[in-house]
């Protein structure tokens, strides 16, 4: 496209009911005029979700989207919504393209649209092609997560990209797990980040004409140590019939190595609590989290004596957590009822 030629969607008539979805490449410095709906009832233009003002370098006015001179930051998704509704009339993405110059000023500018024509591209310093993808400058990431920084760029000649960490060349050789540099995506990927990855990461994009850079700041949040977390509602109150089997479940979450115990509350000399105020308990099962099925307490062939309160107690170096449930044991039912309901065990 000639720099002097406008990008237009004409005529400015009401579009068909099918929303138009398209991608347009616009040369830098080029004026843009896109239409949506009839002039007197034109739709409202939005860029990346924000409605365009009727005045300014980039404006939405009487159904027209007008950009006086296209800049890299103007790239992005534009929507035109019908007045007074959320109906999408236009849905298009404007992409920054290299500006082209013609070797013959008299040549028909429309001919530039034919890719078979020979174009001479002027040299151009690097520029960001998708600045909206670089919007997030400050990254705070939990340890162990993957981080991806992108600096999509273009220029002529095609620029190269290199990365710095805290101002020094960064190749990831001293980083456990290394880094992934995807030059075709202009990206740096670091997996399983650790606190030593904190710092300022700079993408430096260069060609013979010039260079641009952008800084990302990365902070790695160490997982804050906490006592074990027990899933709410577990273990659950359970009712079972004498002679049946029961499973009580306790789901434990803990960064630090947890230790789990299953306790049954008991009565001694008619009292449930000792002089110290703590309940009397019997330890039924104890193990570390990596023991198989430690989070499940199996009670086989239950009797009336098994009824009562059960507690799952989980502890780590930071503290203790516990949750309790009640087991109710019903006497064996008469044969007629049991036959009608063979699944005698149920959970509240």
């Amino acid at each position: 496209l000639e720099a002097s030629e406008e990008v237009e969607l004409e005529p400015c008539l009401a579009p068909s009911l099918e929303q138009q979805e398209q991608e347009l490449t616009v040369a830098l410095g080029q004026p843009v005029r896109l239409c949506c709906g009839r002039a007197e009832r034109g739709g409202h233009w939005y860029k990346e979700g924000s409605r365009l003002a009727p005045a300014g370098r980039v404006r939405g006015w009487r159904g027209r989207l007008e950009i006086a001179s296209f800049l890299p930051e103007d790239a992005g998704r534009y929507l035109c919504l019908a007045r007074g509704s959320m109906i999408v009339l236009q849905n298009l993405t404007l992409i920054t393209g290299d500006s082209l110059t013609s070797s013959n000023d008299d040549e028909d500018p429309k001919s530039h649209r034919d890719p078979s024509n020979r174009h001479s591209y002027p040299q151009q310093a690097p520029y960001w092609t998708h600045p909206q993808r670089m919007e997030k400058k400050l990254h705070a990431v939990p340890a162990g997560n993957t981080v991806k920084f992108r600096c999509p760029a273009a220029g002529n000649p095609t620029p190269t990209i290199r990365w710095l960490k805290d101002g020094q060349a960064f190749h990831g050789e001293n980083r456990i797990g290394g880094i992934r540099l995807r030059h075709q995506h202009w990206s740096l990927v670091m997996e399983s980040v650790v606190p030593s990855d904190r710092g300022t990461y700079t993408c430096l994009v260069e060609n013979a004409v010039g260079s641009i850079r952008y800084n990302y700041l990365l902070d790695v949040l160490e997982r804050s140590p906490h006592r074990p977390i027990l899933q709410a509602g577990l273990p659950a109150n359970t009712t079972a019939v004498v002679g049946s089997d029961v499973e009580l479940l306790c789901k434990v979450y803990s960064d630090a190595q947890p230790h789990i115990q299953w306790l049954k509350h008991i009565v001694i000399n008619g009292s449930s609590f000792g002089a110290d105020g703590f309940p009397y308990v019997q330890v039924l099962k104890t193990a570390d989290i990596n023991s198989s099925e430690v989070e499940v307490l199996y009670l086989r062939n239950v009797s009336a004596e098994d009824a009562g309160e059960y507690t799952c107690l989980a502890g780590n170096s930071i503290g203790l957590s516990y949750q309790s449930a009640w087991l109710t044991v019903l006497p064996e039912e008469d044969p007629t009822w049991t036959a009608a309901a063979p699944e005698a065990r149920y959970t509240d």
């Epitope: 860029k47 919007e135 606190p195 700041l217 804050s224």
Partner: antibody
Framework: EVQLLESGGGLVQPGGSLRLSCAAS????????MGWVRQAPGKGLEWVSV????????DYADSVKGRFTISRDNSKNTLYLQMNSLRAEDTAVYYC???????????WGQGTLVTVSS | QSELTQPPSASGTPGQRVTISCSGG????????AHWYQQLPGTAPKLLIY???QRPSGVPDRFSGSKSGTSASLAISGLRSEDEADYYC???????????FGGGTKLTVL
């Protein structure tokens, strides 16, 4: 609703110290960069300091470097500014601000006035 | 001395359009987004425009922003008396690792 509430301002003599606090609520405090911005009477906004989410990295304006210390307690959702060797030119309203990941201050406290005078 | 340069004052009549300029350097405005804050008399600053041209919810579309190179501008169309305030431009500064502000522009609605 995001809320930032500064406290600790007051009148202090030159050379004295003061500790400002900023209690944050209505958002998850720990992943955000946080900062202090001040405004001298009748003057414009001046950035004072910023602290990274983990608290391990801090940055300061040249005018306060070596005298002010920013810190945070993520368990208490609180930001602090310890101000030592105060000077008359430090007299200002001090605002606590949350820094959006794009680098702008998207929420501000109401400010606390620090007056350094003999 | 502010890192970003703004005119100290601007004025306009109701209904008019006014623009406020802001210029900086490569380490701030040139390589980062421009943001604008409005400070009404006696209140804390409020975010008005972020990321060059985005408006937070609740900010009227009479306010618009743009940026080119190391300069940014804020435009206010259909000026109203309640727009009388101080306006500050700002940008993250890579050399400071923090934000920098313009000196502020006092807007008077005549």
């Amino acid at each position: 609703e995001v809320q930032l509430l500064e406290s600790g301002g007051g009148l202090v003599q030159p050379g004295g110290s003061l500790r400002l606090s900023c209690a944050a609520s209505g958002f998850t405090f720990s992943p955000y960069w946080m900062g202090w911005v001040r405004q001298a009477p009748g003057k414009g906004l001046e950035w004072v300091s910023v602290i990274w989410p983990s608290g391990g990295t801090t940055d300061y304006a040249d005018s306060v470097k070596g005298r002010f210390t920013i810190s945070r307690d993520n368990s208490k959702n609180t930001l602090y500014l310890q101000m030592n060797s105060l000077r008359a030119e430090d007299t200002a309203v001090y605002y606590c601000a949350r820094v959006h990941p794009a680098g702008h201050n998207d929420h501000w406290g109401q400010g606390t006035l620090v007056t350094v005078s003999s | 001395q502010s890192e970003l340069t703004q005119p100290p004052s601007a004025s306009g009549t109701p209904g008019q359009r006014v623009t406020i300029s802001c210029s900086g350097g490569y380490s701030n405005m040139g390589s980062n987004y421009a943001h604008w804050y409005q400070q009404l008399p006696g209140t804390a600053p409020k975010l008005l425009i972020y990321n060059n041209n985005q408006r937070p919810s609740g900010v009227p579309d009479r306010f618009s922003g743009s940026k080119s190179g190391t300069s940014a501008s804020l435009a206010i169309s259909g000026l109203r008396s309640e727009d009388e305030a101080d306006y500050y431009c700002a940008a993250w500064d890579d050399s400071l690792s923090g934000p920098v502000f313009g000196g502020g522009t006092k807007l008077t609605v005549l």
